[in-house]
């Protein structure tokens, strides 16, 4: 059964997923998708990393932690009720049937209060590591659509970032974790 995580409408949701790289910088590809983990890949992929970097993401989805140290926890910005559901974190360990997969259930609750406006910050400055994408799009149209419309001034609030980083520490022990090597 899926581990359940909760967030309120308008907040950033946090879905923990971790692995321990065999050696520093020896990264393993990871994908995140909407929907339970299928036999391969991550259903409708919303974000993925390769051996070096985040190489595909869609708007509102990012990695707030240090993915180079194995923190591949997913942050979903400014969630709505439509973001409820199961998400898949898949750690694509090379070899014969070595993948580790985790299903995480996100429950979105209506907001209790309307949050006051907060200062905005440039997405590129906050997350410079995410400025790489796969070199070409899909040969045919996939269910998810084509490459995301990447807006380099996507907004993230300082308050949400601070809360997410505290939450990351709180949930590290309860999140999906796998040691490699």
């Amino acid at each position: 059964s899926e581990v359940e995580y909760r967030a309120e409408v308008g907040q950033n949701a946090y879905l923990p997923c971790f692995y321990t790289p065999a050696a520093p910088g020896n990264l393993v590809p990871v994908c995140w998708g909407k929907g339970a983990c299928p036999v391969f890949e991550c259903g409708n992929v919303v974000l993925r990393t390769d051996e070096r970097d985040v190489n595909y993401w869609t708007s509102r989805y990012w990695l707030n932690g240090d993915f180079r140290k194995g923190d591949v926890s997913l942050t979903i910005e400014n969630v709505t009720l439509a973001d409820s559901g199961i998400y898949c974190c898949r750690i694509q360990i090379p070899g014969i049937m070595n993948d580790e997969k985790f299903n995480l259930k996100l429950v979105i609750k209506p907001a209790k209060v309307t949050p006051a406006p907060t200062r905005q910050r440039d997405f590129t400055a906050a997350f410079p590591r995410m400025l790489t994408t796969r070199g070409h799009g899909p040969a045919e149209t996939q269910t998810l659509g084509s490459l995301p419309d990447i807006n380099l001034t996507q907004i993230s609030t300082l308050a949400n970032e601070l809360r997410d980083s505290r939450l990351a520490n709180d949930l590290r022990d309860s999140g999906a974790t796998i040691r490699i090597g």
């Epitope: 994908c31 299928p38 036999v39 694509q92 090379p94």
Partner: antibody, heavy 122, light 107 residues
Framework: EVKLVESGGGLVQPGGSLRLSCAAS????????MAWVRQAPGKGLEWVAN????????YYLDSLKSRFTISRDNAKNSLYLQMNSLKAEDTAVYYC???????????????WGQGTLVTVSS | DIQMTQSPSSLSASVGDRVTITCRAS??????LAWYQQKPGKAPQLLVY???TLAEGVPSRFSGSGSGTDFTLTISSLQPEDFATYYC?????????FGQGTKLEIK
């Protein structure tokens, strides 16, 4: 136009080996998982193996993984199946099929080759 | 392993009939189900993926539905070229597994 063309089938004695090939064209080969599926004469479909985009991860039917090896060469747009220690029950038409793509979403074998017949008999 | 059970195993129908084939999974496979059509001596052809999405080029008389463990393939008005064998297949658990097939014959 997407095309998958298998080759390498034929008659082989029990205990022998064969290497099947599948030449792919009409799509970005390295963007897709690829698979082998087989069908014994008059029987249903049976999945054999899958391989991820760059060949670093492979997946097999448990009963076959000690004898069969799936691999790919993205530079040549080719998929392979090395079959060792063949048995009479491995007799089947072997199909190469394109599986899920880099962005997920479409879970089904969208394109198939015409198949190549492997007959294991003495 | 996830077992896929199709029913019926064979079916006789006439051109113009509405036909439904069912597929039951032994475990929850969410919507990771595909349907294929196969004619004698030919490779299978994908009809439906993700339980209900029609593959490119497939006539709209075909439709898929269901999620979890119970799925159906419906042909709203049979055409002469639809007489073939139909297979369901799950993409949720390893190993990937197919149903045993449903042979659709002319009445």
């Amino acid at each position: 136009e997407v095309k998958l063309v298998e080759s390498g089938g034929g008659l082989v004695q029990p205990g022998g080996s064969l290497r099947l090939s599948c030449a792919a064209s009409g799509f970005t080969f390295s963007d897709y998982y690829m698979a082998w599926v087989r069908q014994a004469p008059g029987k249903g479909l049976e999945w054999v193996a899958n391989i991820n985009y760059d060949g670093s991860s492979t997946y097999y039917l448990d009963s076959l993984k000690s004898r069969f090896t799936i691999s790919r060469d993205n530079a040549k747009n080719s998929l392979y199946l090395q079959m060792n220690s063949l048995k009479a029950e491995d007799t089947a038409v072997y199909y190469c099929a394109r599986d899920v793509g880099y962005y997920g979403g479409n879970y089904g074998f969208a394109y198939w080759g015409q198949g190549t017949l492997v007959t294991v008999s003495s | 392993d996830i077992q896929m059970t199709q029913s019926p195993s064979s079916l006789s129908a006439s051109v113009g009939d509405r036909v439904t084939i069912t597929c039951r999974a032994s475990d929850n496979i969410y919507s990771y189900l595909a349907w294929y059509q196969q004619k004698p001596g030919k490779a299978p052809q994908l009809l439906v993926y993700n339980a209900k999405t029609l593959a490119e080029g497939v006539p709209s008389r075909f439709s898929g539905s269901g999620s979890g463990t119970d799925f159906t393939l419906t042909i709203s008005s049979l055409q002469p070229e639809d007489f073939a064998t139909y297979y369901c297949q799950q993409h949720y658990g390893s190993p990937l597994t197919f149903g045993q097939g449903t042979k659709l014959e002319i009445k």
